[in-house]
Interface confidence: low
C-alpha cells in the first residue's frame, strides 16, 4: 500500500506538475542552420468519458506564450493559425490521438533558438505541459558539400562531376547549387541533394579551382567546397610529377589520381625504385619517343573563349629534363593534405600564356 501512495509522488517528481498529465521529450536539441531535426515526444492525459469521442488537438508554443492570444508554432488543428515565421517549417509530426507529440523542424533558422512547450486539447480537457520544455539550439552550418570526380580528368574528355549534400534532409527546401569553374562545362541532371556538372577540361585548366556552392534558401545559409583540377594526359612516355591536394579534407575523389592516392611509405619507395629503373630503360629511347610526340601536337584541344568576366592567367609549363631520380617520390602526410601523383605529357609545350575564363553555372 505505501508503494502505491508513493507512485504519484514519483511521477510528479520525474514528470512534473500533475501526475495525470505527463510528457516525455528531450530537454535540448541542437540543429545546424538550414538543416532539420525530428524530436520524438510522447504525452499522456486522462480521458473523461464525456471527451472520449472528441478529437485530440496538439500545439507547440514558444515559451512564455499566452494561449488565448498567441499563435502556436505548430499544430494539427487545421483551422488554427500558426506563427508566420515557423509556418511550413515546424510541424507536429506525431499523431496526438496516439499520444505522439513529436515535432519536426526543417530549414532551421537562428530565430528558432529558444524553448517550446506542448499543449493538448480534447473537448473540455485542456492542458499545457510547461515541464519539461524543449530547448532548441540552432548552430552554424559546418557541413560542406562533397565533390566526386570518377577516375581521372583528361583534356578533351568529358567527365561527370557530382556535388552532393547527402547530410541535408529530404523534407527541407531543396538547396540551390552553383558551380564555378574555368573549364568548359555544362549542367547535367540534378536530384534533391546533388548536382552534376559535365566538364571537358583543357590542359590549361590544370591547377585551376572548381567550386560547388550550395545555398539553403529556406534559411538563407550557404556552404561550399573548392577543389583544384588535376588534368592528366596519359602519353606513351610519361614522367611522374607531384601535385599537392587542396587541404580541404579527404571526402572527395580527386582528379588525376593514378590508382588512387599513393598510400604508405613502403609502396612509395617501391614505386620510386621502379621509376628509376624505367627511367634508364626509357632514356635510351628518348629521341625516338620525342619524334613521335612532335607528331601528336594535333591532340592539343582548342581553347575557345567566352565572356572575359573573370580572367585568370594560367601557365602550363613544359617538363624539365632530368638525368637522375632525385626527389621524385611523393611523401605521405599525416594531416589533412594529401599528395597525388599525376602524369605529364612531354610533347605538349605551349609557348605562350593561355587565358582562362571562369564561368558560373547555377541550378535551382
Amino acid at each position: 500500500m505505501p508503494l502505491l501512495l508513493l507512485l504519484p509522488l514519483l511521477w510528479a517528481g520525474a514528470l512534473a506538475m500533475d501526475p495525470n498529465f505527463w510528457l516525455q521529450v528531450q530537454e535540448s536539441v541542437t540543429v545546424q542552420e538550414g538543416l532539420c531535426v525530428l524530436v520524438p515526444c510522447t504525452f499522456f492525459h486522462p480521458i473523461p468519458y464525456y471527451d472520449k469521442n472528441s478529437p485530440v488537438h496538439g500545439y507547440w508554443f514558444r515559451e512564455g506564450a499566452i494561449i488565448s492570444r498567441d499563435s502556436p508554432v505548430a499544430t494539427n488543428k487545421l483551422d488554427q493559425e500558426v506563427q508566420e515565421e515557423t509556418q511550413g517549417r515546424f510541424r507536429l509530426l506525431g499523431d496526438p490521438s496516439r499520444n505522439n507529440c513529436s515535432l519536426s523542424i526543417v530549414d532551421a533558422r537562428r530565430r528558432d533558438n529558444g524553448s517550446y512547450f506542448f499543449r493538448m486539447e480534447r473537448g473540455s480537457t485542456k492542458y499545457s505541459y510547461k515541464s519539461p520544455q524543449l530547448s532548441v539550439h540552432v548552430t552554424d552550418l559546418t557541413h560542406r558539400p562533397k565533390i566526386l570526380i570518377p577516375g581521372t580528368l583528361e583534356p578533351g574528355h568529358s567527365k561527370n562531376l557530382t556535388c552532393s549534400v547527402s547530410w541535408a534532409c529530404e523534407q527541407g527546401t531543396p538547396p540551390i547549387f552553383s558551380w564555378l569553374s574555368a573549364a568548359p562545362t555544362s549542367l547535367g541532371p540534378r536530384t534533391t541533394h546533388s548536382s552534376v556538372l559535365i566538364i571537358t577540361p583543357r590542359p590549361q585548366d590544370h591547377g585551376t579551382n572548381l567550386t560547388c556552392q550550395v545555398k539553403f534558401a529556406g534559411a538563407g545559409v550557404t556552404t561550399e567546397r573548392t577543389i583544384q583540377l588535376n588534368v592528366t594526359y596519359v602519353p606513351q612516355n610519361p614522367t611522374t610529377g607531384i601535385f599537392p591536394g587542396d587541404g580541404s579534407g579527404k571526402q572527395e575523389t580527386r582528379a588525376g589520381v593514378v590508382h588512387g592516392a599513393i598510400g604508405g611509405a613502403g609502396v612509395t619507395a617501391l614505386l620510386a625504385l621502379c621509376l628509376c629503373l624505367i627511367f634508364f630503360i626509357v632514356k635510351t629511347h628518348r629521341r625516338k619517343a620525342a619524334r613521335t610526340a612532335v607528331g601528336r601536337n594535333d591532340t592539343h584541344p582548342t581553347t575557345g573563349s567566352a565572356s572575359p568576366k573573370h580572367q585568370k592567367k594560367s601557365k602550363l609549363h613544359g617538363p624539365t629534363e632530368t638525368s637522375s631520380c632525385s626527389g621524385a617520390a611523393p611523401t605521405v602526410e599525416m594531416d589533412e593534405e594529401l599528395h597525388y601523383a599525376s602524369l605529364n605529357f612531354h610533347g605538349m609545350n605551349p609557348s605562350k600564356d593561355t587565358s582562362t575564363e571562369y564561368s558560373e553555372v547555377r541550378t535551382q
Epitope: F61, R62, I66, D70, S71, Q83, E84, Q87, R109
Partner: nanobody, 120 residues
C-alpha cells in the same frame, strides 16, 4: 494583400505622450512580425520598434528604449506604439510595417504614415 492604416499622430509638447495605432486588414494578422518605423525630414527611415507575431519578443531602437512601448492585439488586428517623454528629435512621420521578409531583411507591407510633431 494587407492594408495598414496608421492613426493617433498629432502635435505634442516635449515630455508629452501619444499612442499610435495601426489597423490591419486583409490576410491574417497574428502570424506577422510587425514594426514601427519613422522618417524625419531629410533623414533616412529608421526602425523604432518591432514585435513578434506571438507578442513575446520585442526590439527597440536605442534612442527610444524606456520611453516607447510596442504592443499588439491580435484579436483586433491592431498594432500600437505608446510614446512617452517625447522629445523634439522624435518629430517624424511614423510608419507601420507588417510581415518581415527574412531573405530581404525588410518588411513587405507598409502604411501611409502618420505625422508626429514635438514642439514647445
Amino acid at each position: 494583400e494587407v492594408q495598414l492604416v496608421e492613426s493617433g499622430g498629432g502635435e505634442v509638447q516635449p515630455g508629452g505622450s501619444l499612442r499610435l495605432s495601426c489597423a490591419a486588414s486583409g490576410r491574417t494578422f497574428s502570424g506577422y512580425i510587425m514594426g514601427w518605423f519613422r522618417q524625419a525630414p531629410g533623414k533616412e527611415r529608421e526602425l523604432v520598434a518591432r514585435i513578434s507575431g506571438n507578442n513575446l519578443a520585442t526590439e527597440y531602437a536605442e534612442s527610444v528604449k524606456g520611453r516607447f512601448t510596442i504592443s499588439r492585439d491580435n484579436a483586433k488586428n491592431t498594432l500600437y506604439l505608446q510614446m512617452s517623454s517625447l522629445r523634439a528629435e522624435d518629430t517624424a512621420v511614423y510608419y507601420c510595417a507588417a510581415e518581415y521578409d527574412y531573405s530581404s531583411g525588410d518588411f513587405v507591407y507598409w502604411g501611409q504614415g502618420t505625422l508626429v510633431t514635438v514642439k514647445p
